[in-house]
């Protein structure tokens, strides 16, 4: 039985050229996290954090994605094309798979706010 919940940073905005932290947190379960996959809106993988082998950044993002903090991901040198949905997928044992959603809006404006509050989707 899957008892856990994924908390995410929800809807966030950040400046073009800046950076943003994508963060998910799995709570209310004792399940072991074997791997966390980070995907972009077009389902392309940005990064994988494997419990045994560590972080793996996909080639297309290796110059502007930094692992962490924790199981989160830092996306740097933001462009307008980065606007969209991001998904964290927690593969756990024995529960199975948990998935969280974050919506990132990249703004031209220099007064873009970076919201860091956590939400339960």
């Amino acid at each position: 039985m899957m008892t856990g919940t994924i908390e995410t940073t929800g809807n966030i905005s950040a400046k073009k050229g800046g950076s943003v932290i994508l963060q998910c947190h799995l709570s209310s379960t004792m399940a072991q996290v074997t791997q966390v996959n980070w995907e972009q809106h077009d389902h392309s993988l940005l990064a994988i954090r494997n419990a045994e082998l560590g972080w793996h950044i996909y080639p297309a993002f290796k110059d502007r994605v930094a692992p962490g903090p924790g199981l989160g991901l830092t996306l740097q040198s933001l462009t307008m094309n980065d606007t969209g949905e991001y998904f964290c997928t927690y593969h756990t044992y024995p529960d199975g798979t948990y998935r969280g959603r974050i919506f990132l809006e990249v703004l031209e404006s220099s007064v873009a706010e970076h919201s860091a509050r956590f939400q339960i989707p």
Partner: antibody, heavy 123, light 109 residues
Framework: QLQLQESGPGLVKPSETLSLTCTVS??????????WGWIRQPPGKGLEWIGS???????YYNPSLKSRVTISVDTSKNQFSLKLSSVTAADTAVYYC???????????????WGQGTMVTVSS | EIVLTQSPGTLSLSPGERATLSCRAS???????LAWYQQKPGQAPRLLIY???SRATGIPDRFSGSGSGTDFTLTISRLEPEDFAVYYC??????????FGGGTKVEIK
Amino acid sequence: QLQLQESGPGLVKPSETLSLTCTVSGGSIASGSYYWGWIRQPPGKGLEWIGSIYYSGQTYYNPSLKSRVTISVDTSKNQFSLKLSSVTAADTAVYYCARDGVLTLNKRSFDIWGQGTMVTVSS
Amino acid sequence: EIVLTQSPGTLSLSPGERATLSCRASQSVSSSYLAWYQQKPGQAPRLLIYGASSRATGIPDRFSGSGSGTDFTLTISRLEPEDFAVYYCQQHTVRPPLTFGGGTKVEIK
């Protein structure tokens, strides 16, 4: 479709270093989803995993061979290589390269293999 | 390391018969990490089953895998002439390191 091809000397002298290269064709070694591994099989015996590498150079090795093994990758040539030092007759085997799905979780396996190359250690 | 013990070492059967191959692990293995391979003389191994029970692409449905924990089974429901070969199980953990079983030879009776 994706193909792997091993190459290297078929004969190596005892105490020297065995060097093999695996060339990947029909796909990129830098796909991001896979490691790339080496497995060997002594004549008439079973399979032994040696180690695997990610496109970025991250590796994991069989502890029993780790002190003698170096695996490297060259993404510009779509190749990865194996070096095994201080070889003895016990290292005589068919050496295979294969795609390692360790990051695919429920599909963890070696799903695509090269045809293998025989390496004999003898003076 | 996790030792995989395959039995029997050799299985002598006739075409059309059912083959049941066993793979026993020295400690519990996640079924997600258990694979089976077929190897014919002079050829590289070919992936048959991953995740203990999922058939790899292009593998006929006469091959099936089952099991969990420490006991896994590969079943060939009806042996075809091309199925006579050596079969290996493999567990794909990182720590302890991944290992192969010693193999089961399926030969023509």
